[in-house]
Interface confidence: low
């Protein structure tokens, strides 16, 4: 009993020193290692170019960021058990092992931005890291979020996805991140935003995703986000928003919009009658088309300013229609063709205005119809819409009077969107993607199709309501 | 609020060393760069130096490579300026300031903006 | 200097003044300016930051803009208080470190 006793205290004695050992251990060559207030091992700037060996154990803090490490090969940090920040940034990293970050279950922050020819990243890189609450991967060159990438981190509050080359939103890529508040995915290719990829973003506070190629927001895209209270949307391709997407945003406060290609004729009435209503600080909304309201800003205009369907033979060039085909330049969602079956939502020249005639087109006088101009042309192409200027300008200063901005009314049949099948697809019928608020969610066909306040069969009460509150269209 | 109290008035001999402390009171470096700025009598602002105390690793002006020692201790917030082999020239006010850390992947030393200001501490090198 | 401000620079109370800073393109043509007020016997104050942004408590009447690799302060409705040096700076990408103005001395007339 005695000699196991002593045998103890020599295997403490021995646990002990090896523990002290590590604190103590010899620091990398090109790097500082301190105790207090926590271990770290900090080697930023130093021309290294791989992970240097023999990190004391012990660190809590590792700062690699600014060298020239290129991979990080599996379980590197496997031994820094209690590790909980590590920095990579700003090095050249083309290639993370799968398991690079295998025993890293404290760990808190990590940064891999400014690592331009990474590209891509294992789904299993950070799988393991339930503790994890700050992510940064901007600037990294990649080019898509493979599946299940981000699975598991459910304690992740920050993640900075901005300044990327991502063209697609993924179906749930973000569904474990309960706990997220801020998401930054400015800067990159997005073209559109589909109904499930922001699912599971429960606690989200900040959205951005300014600077991309967005000209479509799913209806229901925005549906978890209902503690939201900045959003920016300003320098996409976007010339119409949904108000249905708009309307789970209870706690919306920020909203910038600026710098799209919006389209402000009748389609434009739902998201006007929206930003009406808004209690929270908007940027403007300036106006692309039709040509006589260009630069105006949408929020100022008065609802009969919005009339009638604009037509564009070619970006900024509009033609006013009372009358439109399939095969129009941009062509037109069904609400503005009078040979639609959808005889509630289009005015034919000519007919007086009338409960069964409410929220019609006008054709200005002298306005001819447009030739069979040439082919489909999209507003704004360049590669991230209008890019603002270094210094953007501050949000309007309006403090919100209620806590929660009232959506538009989300009552009424679900009606199939203004974009038949032959066309639903092509680029010109996102001029329709006005927004749906009064229209149900619409069965539409694909996430290419959008339903429209305008373009639904209204039931006779709301099309009277509608008709006395907005005047006709 | 944080504010940042230096040290006292020094004199020095030339050719002797003078070392200023700089404490944060109200908050910490933790997410901070702390810099250094000096003035000489009627002259301009003049940066000299700065480090963010988590890293540990200072960045210094090229004119006072060799002469001056940055240091930082975290736990107790603050920062330590050190200048060697004075010389008349170096009569000045001597500032810390402190310089918001942007997070992540900004490099340790990047553009952003000195506030608050320490009160200064004026050193004279007379023989 | 790095950064080339006039010495000096006058206005009357209500007048409009406005004082340069001209640099380069490794400073004020890739980075940000900040600007700070230094009022007789006190320690610099920031003033404006990231070219034309004015922290909690600067007045109105302080405004930033950048352009190219030159920026400017302008200061509306003088008042006898702005009397005092002003400093534009900012990061240099050439000398890893922030450089100054040499200042300019407003007087209120």
């Known amino acids: 009993m005695k000699r196991a006793s002593a045998g103890g205290s020599r295997l403490l004695a021995w646990v002990l020193w090896l523990q002290a050992w590590q604190v103590a251990a010899p620091c990398p060559g090109a790097c500082v290692c301190y105790n207090e207030p926590k271990v770290t091992t900090s080697c930023p700037q130093q021309g290294l170019q791989a992970v240097p060996v023999g990190i004391p154990a012990a660190s809590q803090r590792i700062f690699l960021h600014g060298n020239r490490i290129s991979h990080v090969p599996a379980a590197s940090f496997r031994a820094c058990r209690n590790l909980t920040i590590l920095w990579l940034h700003s090095n050249v990293l083309a290639r993370i092992d799968a398991a690079a970050f295998t025993g890293l279950a404290l760990l808190e922050q990590l940064d891999l931005s400014d690592n331009a020819q990474l590209r891509s990243v294992d789904p299993a890189t950070f799988h393991g890291l339930g503790r994890l609450h700050t992510l940064h991967l901007d600037r990294c060159g990649l080019q898509e979020l493979g599946p299940g990438l981000f699975r598991g981190l459910a304690a992740l509050q920050y993640l900075y996805l901005q300044d990327n080359a991502l063209q697609a939103l993924p179906d749930d890529t973000f569904r474990d991140l309960g706990n997220l508040t801020h998401l930054f995915l400015h800067g990159n290719r997005i073209s559109s935003v589909p109904e499930r990829a922001f699912r599971g973003l429960h606690s989200l506070d900040r959205l951005l995703l300014h600077q991309n190629r967005v000209a479509h927001v799913h209806p229901h895209a925005f549906r978890d986000l209902g503690r939201l209270m900045t959003l920016y949307l300003f320098a996409n391709n976007l010339s119409a928003l949904p108000t249905e997407a708009l309307a789970p945003l209870r706690a919306l406060q920020y909203l910038r919009l600026n710098d799209n290609p919006w389209v402000c004729d009748c389609r434009a009435r739902p998201l006007w009658a929206w930003l009406q209503k808004f209690r929270g600080s908007s940027s403007e909304v300036p106006c692309s088309l039709p040509q006589r309201l260009a630069g105006r800003d949408l929020k100022r205009l008065a609802a009969n300013d919005l009339q009638g369907c604009a037509v564009a033979t070619g970006p900024y060039h509009p033609i006013w229609t009372g009358r439109a085909t399939d095969e129009e330049p941009l062509g037109l969602p069904k609400c503005c063709q009078p040979d639609a079956a959808d005889k509630a939502s289009v005015l034919e020249p000519g007919r007086p205005a009338s409960a069964g005639n409410a929220l019609k087109g006008r054709v200005p006088p002298g306005d001819s119809p447009p030739g069979n101009g040439s082919g489909p042309r999209h507003i704004n192409d360049s590669p991230f819409g209008t890019l603002p200027g270094s210094a953007e300008p501050p949000l309007t200063a309006v403090r919100p009077e209620g806590s929660e901005p009232p959506g538009f009314p989300t009552s009424g049949p679900r009606r199939r969107p203004g974009c038949s099948r032959k066309n639903r697809t092509r680029s010109h019928c996102r001029l329709g993607q006005a927004g749906s608020g009064g229209g149900g969610t619409g069965d539409s066909e694909g996430s290419g199709a959008l339903p429209s306040l305008t373009c639904s069969l209204t039931p006779l009460g709301l099309a009277l309501v509608l008709w006395t509150v907005l005047g006709p269209c | 609020e944080v504010q940042l109290v230096e040290t006292g008035a020094e004199v020095k001999k030339p050719g002797s060393s003078v070392k200023v402390s700089c404490k944060a009171s109200?908050?910490?470096?933790?997410?901070?760069?702390v810099s250094w700025v000096r003035q000489a009598p009627g002259q301009g602002l003049e940066w000299m130096g700065g480090?963010?105390?988590?890293?540990?690793?200072?960045n210094y002006a090229q004119k006072f490579q060799g002469r001056l020692t940055i240091t930082a201790d975290e736990s107790t917030s603050t920062a330590y300026m050190e200048l060697s082999s004075l010389r008349s020239e170096d009569t000045a006010i001597y500032y810390c300031?402190?310089?918001?850390?942007?997070?992540?992947?900004?490099?340790?030393?990047?553009?952003?903006?000195?506030?608050?200001w320490g009160q200064g501490t004026l050193v004279t090198v007379s023989s | 200097y790095e950064l080339t401000q006039p010495p000096s620079a006058s206005g009357t109370p209500g007048q409009r003044v406005t004082i340069s800073c001209s640099g380069s393109?490794?400073?004020?043509?890739?980075?940000?300016v900040n600007w700070y007020q230094q009022l007789p016997g006190t320690a610099p104050k920031l003033l404006i930051y990231?070219?034309?942004q004015r922290p909690s408590g600067v007045p109105d009447r302080f405004s930033g803009s950048k352009s190219g690799t030159s920026a400017s302060l302008a200061i509306s409705g003088l008042q006898s208080e702005d009397e005092a040096d002003y400093y534009c700076?900012?990061?240099?990408?050439?000398?890893?470190?922030?450089?100054f103005g040499g200042g300019t001395k407003l007087t209120v007339l």
């Open positions: 300031a402190r310089k918001p850390y942007l997070g992540g992947r900004y490099s340790a030393f990047t553009p952003s903006w000195f506030d608050p």
């Open positions: 109200g908050g910490t470096f933790s997410n901070y760069a």
């Open positions: 480090i963010i105390p988590i890293f540990g690793i200072p």
């Open positions: 393109s490794s400073n004020i043509g890739s980075n940000t």
């Open positions: 990231s070219n034309n």
């Open positions: 700076a900012a990061w240099d990408d050439s000398l890893n470190g922030v450089v």
